[in-house]
């Protein structure tokens, strides 16, 4: 037979059950806590810290673009997509068209001063939506050259050159002297693209990758 | 109201949830731990009647209304 | 982690104590119930002999150990 | 070698349009560069005026947008610069100068220039 | 368009000395900067282009340097042969516009 508990030792035994429980308890709630804080406190250090973030970015931007238009991505506050407030958007790249007439090279570096590069057209679409902005007597540097003259085309971005995804105006390329490619106009054929030489001056096109902030 | 937001509340709604049901699991642990000792006093005592303490202990457990 | 993927994860780790703490305390109140039930036979009848049925709830109620 | 020669009237009247022509030997007009005009007042301050490329599109000097044109002939290898309602101000020499040398970073040929003097 | 600012309009030295001209752009003109001499009845003549890079066959004596909207031309150990008119001009951007000038002449 098991000896029996004093009630006193029944009372003691009850206390520091009490004890354990109720230190559970708070020790339990404690976590919730913690929990709730991080849930709370640090979604605001985030934002503040992604705030901070943002505005770097913009101090690093706004040297050449002084004002940003931006539109909300998705339903999430946070993602905002911007470009140069004169620049124009499609997909997730922004578009400039430059109206100074200057060299291949200089059209280029004209871009990279502005954070981005000669336009490089990957798509009908792409091509479809930049020619809305330009005008029919004019002509525009692309991001595409071939340095050597051996025909060997390349992006500025170094995009692969997909013979496939070109709008060559019939019969372009057709001088191997002529080692830059412009977008222009033709009553026949409409918009497309025809190798010029490089230091000739023409407007250009630029393009960037939308600002995310 | 947007998505972040609706999260929030609904953290703050989970929180409260949590501190209340840990709080009455806790009272409720205690108050099992006492039935069992009252239980075990009553079985060992039945001709010396039941203490006060242990009435409303018994009373307690009887007739309380489950939380909803 | 995204902002909006660390409400997300403490609602879900909010969520689970809130049901597992749910459970526990439904679990518990069910004992109590029984418990309460089981009192209330022992009072009345202390002369027949507690029944097995009887005798495993009292013995739950008596040793059981308290959920960490 | 790439040579430049520039030929007109010396003297042009106000009102009346200015005329010039310049004549390009040991290169063609067609195969590259573009083709301009300058001019340097009797003060010596230099202008570039406009210029004609070698697949015969044009640009020109804001300044000078409604009163020129230049055109070319490809088959004598000569371009051509007009100037309407000319005034006083527009007494300059007058050079023809290929554009795009050193990827379009200098001028390295000019005409020896032709004075055009605007007087009634 | 770009302005060009050139100082100063004249200047006398003797055979022998070093002289500086400069340059001031309205705009940053990345280094399309060019130099030219000009002698009395004469056109032109391209000295350096692309800032600092001299033509073949100009003498070692002259220098271009600068960046940004601020240039120089440096000629050191003036020769008889140096004296004339000299001019800037930009080419970064079309209207390619010219400096006012600089007169060097021999005291």
């Known amino acids: 037979m098991v000896p029996e508990e004093e009630p006193q030792d029944r009372e003691k035994g009850l206390w520091w059950f009490q004890l354990k429980v109720w230190s559970m308890a708070v020790v339990s709630i404690l976590l919730l806590s913690v929990c709730f804080t991080v849930s709370s406190v640090v979604p605001h250090n985030f934002m503040y810290s992604k705030t901070v973030k943002r505005l770097s970015k913009l101090r690093e931007y706004q040297q050449y673009h002084p004002s940003l238009t931006c539109v909300m991505e998705g339903k999430d506050i946070e993602d905002w997509s911007c470009c140069p407030t004169p620049w124009t958007s499609f997909q997730s790249s922004c578009y400039f068209i430059s109206t100074g007439m200057q060299s291949w090279t200089k059209s280029q570096k004209n871009c990279s001063v502005m954070g981005a590069d000669l336009v490089v057209i990957n798509t009908r679409e792409e091509q479809d939506f930049i020619i809305q902005n330009l005008k029919r007597n004019s002509s525009y540097f692309l991001g595409l050259s071939d340095p050597g003259g051996r025909r060997h085309w390349q992006w500025v971005d170094q995009t692969p050159y997909n013979e496939n995804v070109t709008f060559w105006h019939s019969g372009e390329p057709n001088n191997l002297d002529e080692r830059c490619a412009i977008i222009n106009f033709r009553s026949s054929e409409e918009w497309g693209w025809n190798d010029i030489h490089c230091h000739v001056p023409q407007k250009s096109i630029c393009k960037m990758k939308k600002i995310y902030i | 109201l947007g998505e972040p937001q609706l999260c929030y509340i609904l953290d703050a709604i989970l929180f409260l949830y949590g501190i209340v049901l840990t709080l009455l699991y806790c009272r409720l642990k205690i108050q099992v731990r006492k039935a069992a000792i009252t239980s075990y006093e009553k079985s060992d005592g039945v001709y010396t009647g039941l203490s006060t303490r242990n009435q409303e202990t018994y009373e307690t457990l009887k007739h309380e209304k489950p939380p909803q | 982690l995204g902002e909006p993927q660390l409400c997300y994860i403490l609602d879900a780790i909010l969520f689970l104590y809130g049901i597992v703490l749910t459970l526990l305390y439904c679990r518990l109140k069910i004992q109590v119930r029984k418990a309460a039930i089981t009192s209330y036979e022992k009072s009345d009848g202390v002369y027949t002999g507690l029944s097995t049925r009887n005798q495993e709830t009292y013995e739950t109620l008596k040793h059981e150990k308290p959920p960490q | 070698d790439v040579q430049l020669q520039e030929s007109g009237p010396g003297l042009v009247k106000p009102s009346q349009s200015l005329s010039l022509t310049c004549s390009v030997t040991?290169?063609?007009?067609?195969?590259?560069?573009?083709w301009n005009w300058v001019r340097q007042f009797p003060g010596n301050q230099l202008e570039c005026m406009g210029y004609?490329?070698?697949?015969?599109?044009?640009n020109y000097n804001p300044s000078l947008k409604n009163r020129i044109s230049i055109t070319r002939d490809t088959s004598k290898n000569q371009f051509f610069l007009k100037l309407n309602s000319v005034t006083t101000e527009d007494t300059a020499t007058y050079y023809c100068?290929?554009?795009?040398?050193?990827?379009?970073?200098?001028?390295?040929?000019w005409g020896q220039g032709t004075l055009v003097t605007v007087s009634a | 368009d770009i302005q060009m600012t050139q100082s100063p309009a004249s200047l006398s030295a003797s055979v022998g000395e070093t002289v500086t001209i400069t340059c001031r752009a309205s705009?940053?003109?990345?280094?399309?900067l060019a130099w030219y001499q000009q002698k009395q009845g004469k056109s032109p003549q391209l000295l350096v282009y692309n800032a600092k890079t001299l033509v073949d066959g100009v003498p070692s004596r002259f220098s271009g340097s600068g960046s940004g909207t601020e240039y120089s031309l440096k000629i050191n150990s003036l020769q008889p042969e140096d004296f004339g008119i000299y001019f800037c001009?930009?080419?970064?951007?079309?209207?390619?516009?010219f400096g006012g000038g600089t007169k060097l002449e021999i005291r």
């Open positions: 004609i490329t070698y697949d015969g599109s044009n």
């Open positions: 001009q930009h080419f970064w951007i079309i209207p390619y516009t």
């Open positions: 705009g940053n003109i990345h280094n399309y």
């Open positions: 040991g290169y063609s007009i067609t195969s590259a560069y573009y």
């Open positions: 100068v290929r554009g795009g040398d050193y990827d379009d970073g200098g001028f390295a040929y």
